[in-house]
């Protein structure tokens, strides 16, 4: 902390400005009235303060609002937001998607950061939901975002939101995550027509039932192997040889480079080899 | 509940062949799900698979013990069992059988017997 | 093969401590990777399944995540019973494969 001094004579700072970058930290303290920083913070961005500088601006708005900032004054942190701690961030109550991006912009290119995540979940609680426009903000800085919530949270995802899903947000989902987010997929695409329906709910299917997966079968879908291979297990191994068949279609052939691996593995196992060798692919259960 | 007993000799000579059995109770070898494995520990090493088999008779060996192993499976007793031919002092382990649902992992394992390989 | 390669091989902690394992895939696995538990003199025991999955009957504090070639064995708060060895495994590939181990003792 810095000792509390006086100002010196004519140091009194009127506004913030490039003036104060050749003040010391005690003289910053000590000249530079908190409330008007607070109400000029959009120019502490554009100069070029140290940062132990930084650190005696903290200083001064803790001490301003000691149970949190505004929203007024956090939307205008800049690179300040850096220098908070999850603690300091627990404190605010961010409601506004502008203050949001504003924040999130400052750690662009940066894995998710402790101070970061916790904002996102005080402006995600905030809400309620994660509704659409959120959900497109969050997943434009952070791609894997989406598969870092818990199934718990993301059942607070609303059918609506899923439109924003791309299938690269999916990426790192696991099983149990899936689980969650394809029930709400079918229910947001649910009114497209078989061959656009399965595009959209393509990326989604790593949490489909077995039932569903027969469907897709009926409809010449001609699912890639990349889509095969993240089914879930479970739903995988009561499919016959013919389904998988009519659901791979012209990819059928790729079952053979995958033997090795699960579900692949898991389902050529438990079927009969009759059955597997009218595929012609030298597959052995 | 399902519950897997290792029985078999405890010590085998170098150059012998290695036989072990595992009866499993309280459940059927001939499940759906689950595969059936052998899993061994050298004293103070790690875990290193052997090989499963599915009631089916199909079977898939660790790539570098599978000149030496066969695994197989008696539904009639319920059990399934492991020969390691060739045996040397570097074979000496715990040996332990494992049931595995195709969903999870390792679920249910023997308690584990030691077979020392010496003259 | 797919190697797994675990770190660190061991550590010391207190009772109430935060522990996190790693464990790392020469290649991808996807989401199968298990993790078990061993105290000496016993057969290992399932906690973690599919990467994330907590096994029936293992106390919340575990937790794993992870994909592709990254996982992590994560022990919110390291209780008296927890000190033992941990292992994780791929089931990916048709050749099943152990990391080294994680030996976790008391500090």
């Known amino acids: 902390e810095v000792e509390k001094t006086a100002c010196p004579s004519g140091k009194k700072a009127r506004e913030i400005d490039e003036s104060l970058i050749f003040y010391k930290k005690w003289e910053l303290e000590a000249c530079v009235d908190a409330a008007l920083l607070a109400t000029q913070m959009d120019r502490v961005n554009a100069i070029p303060f140290t940062y132990e500088q930084l650190d005696v601006l903290k200083h001064k708005l803790d001490e301003l609002y000691p149970q949190g900032y505004p929203e007024s004054v956090i939307q205008h942190l800049g690179y300040l937001f850096l220098k908070m701690s999850p603690e300091d961030i627990r404190k605010w109550n961010v409601t506004s998607l502008e203050t949001l991006k504003a924040l999130l912009e400052v750690n662009k290119g940066h894995e998710m950061s402790p101070q970061v995540a916790t904002l996102i979940d005080r402006f995600v609680k905030g809400r309620g939901q994660l509704d659409k426009d959120t959900l497109d903000t969050l997943t434009a800085f952070y791609p894997g975002y989406l598969c870092s919530l818990s199934p718990e949270e993301l059942s607070s995802v609303p059918p609506s939101s899923i439109w924003a899903v791309r299938p690269q947000d999916l990426d790192t989902c696991d099983p149990r995550q899936l689980d969650v987010l394809y029930p709400k997929a079918r229910l947001a695409f649910q009114n497209m027509n078989g061959s656009e329906y399965f595009v959209k709910i393509q990326s989604f299917l790593g949490g489909a039932p077995t039932e569903d997966l027969k469907a897709l079968s009926q409809q010449n879908v001609s699912m890639d192997l990349a889509t095969f291979m993240k089914l879930r297990t479970d739903a995988v191994l009561p499919l016959t040889v013919a389904e998988v068949q009519k659901l791979l279609g012209p990819h059928v052939e790729g079952l053979k480079a995958e033997e090795r691996h699960r579900p692949v593995r898991d389902w050529i196992l438990r079927q009969r080899q009759d059955d597997l060798d009218t595929l012609g692919l030298g597959l052995q259960g | 509940q399902v519950q897997l007993q290792e029985s078999g000799p405890g010590l085998v000579k170098p150059s012998e062949t290695l036989s072990l059995t595992c009866t499993v109770s309280?459940?059927?070898?001939?499940?759906?799900?689950?595969?059936w494995s052998w899993i061994r520990q050298p004293p103070g090493k790690g875990l290193e698979w052997i090989g499963y088999i599915y009631y089916s008779g199909s079977t898939n060996y660790n790539p570098s013990l599978k000149s030496r192993v066969t695994i197989s499976v008696d539904t009639s007793k319920n059990q399934f069992s492991l020969k390691l031919s060739s045996v040397t002092a570097a074979d000496t382990a715990v040996y332990y059988c494992?049931?595995?649902?195709?969903?999870?992992?390792?679920?249910?394992w023997g308690q584990g017997t030691m077979v020392t390989v010496s003259s | 093969d797919i190697q797994m390669t675990q770190s660190p091989s061991s550590l010391s902690a207190s009772v109430g401590d935060r522990v996190t394992i790693t464990c790392r895939a020469s290649?991808?696995?996807?989401?199968?990777v298990n993790w078990y538990q061993q105290k000496p003199g016993k057969a290992p025991k399932l906690l973690i399944y599919a990467a994330s999955s907590l096994q029936s009957g293992v106390p919340s504090r575990f937790s794993g995540s992870g994909s592709g070639t990254d996982f992590t064995l994560t022990i919110s708060s390291l209780q008296p019973e927890d000190f033992a060895t941990y292992y994780c495994q791929q089931s990916y590939d048709a050749s099943y494969t152990f990391g080294g181990g994680t030996k976790v003792e008391i500090k």
């Open positions: 290649q991808s696995s996807r989401y199968y």
């Open positions: 309280g459940g059927s070898v001939s499940s759906y799900h689950d595969l």
């Open positions: 494992a049931r595995e649902d195709a969903l999870t992992g390792f679920d249910i």
